[in-house]
Amino acid sequence: QPDAINAPVTCCYNFTNRKISVQRLASYRRITSSKCPKEAVIFKTIVAKEICADPKQKWVQDSMDHLDKQTQTPKT
């Protein structure tokens, strides 16, 4: 049984300084651990590359909104 207390924590220490096209993005996850120095978003691209981004930036927020909409279940 894995020990959750010792589970590794992923942190972002630097953010991308380039805006990523939403067409290249597949998903995102938040980094909110108090063990990390920065609040962050990790985008996963369609080629499975992970990129750290600053959640304070508008393009990051807009990209999260775009990805959220793709999770909607169509209404019948």
Epitope: S27, Y28, R29, R30, T32, E39, V41, P55, K56, V60, Q61, D62, M64, D65, L67, D68, K69, T71, Q72, T73
Partner: nanobody, 123 residues
Framework: EVQLVESGGGLVQAGGSLRLSCAAS????????MGWFRQAPGKEREFVTL????????DYTDSVKGRFTISRDNAKNTVSLQMNNLKPADTAVYYC????????????????WGQGTQVTVSS
């Protein structure tokens, strides 16, 4: 860590209006999708409405469409729910929630929750 505090609940007669507010602190408010959920006595918590980070997209459960309006002020770290033409069936504890995770309107998509505010609609 995001903290959420709701206010504005109360007792209102059927056909009346209430405006709920939710004040957020901690984290970057404009980076969270915000939602309102409600839980009536003896029932499961259910989605009411949500608003995207930009405020440009909203969604509502069918039973409140045309009566409820969600809005947000990213400068003031607040999200509001204007409730008009209230019905006894709207009686519930209303919860403000913040979503950092990818998703839409499922409870599991929301990471942070307020303590709730009671709305009672009498006939």
């Amino acid at each position: 860590e995001v903290q959420l505090v709701e206010s504005g609940g109360g007792l209102v007669q059927a056909g009346g209006s209430l405006r709920l507010s939710c004040a957020a602190s901690g984290g970057t408010f404009s980076s969270y999708r915000m939602g309102w959920f409600r839980q009536a006595p003896g029932k499961e918590r259910e989605f009411v409405t949500l608003i995207s980070r930009s405020g440009g997209t909203t969604d509502y459960t069918d039973s409140v469409k045309g009566r409820f309006t969600i809005s947000r002020d990213n400068a003031k770290n607040t999200v509001s729910l204007q409730m008009n033409n209230l019905k006894p069936a709207d009686t519930a504890v209303y919860y403000c929630a913040a979503a950092g995770s990818m998703g839409w309107n499922h409870l599991r998509d929301y990471d942070y929750w307020g303590q709730g505010t009671q709305v009672t609609v009498s006939s």
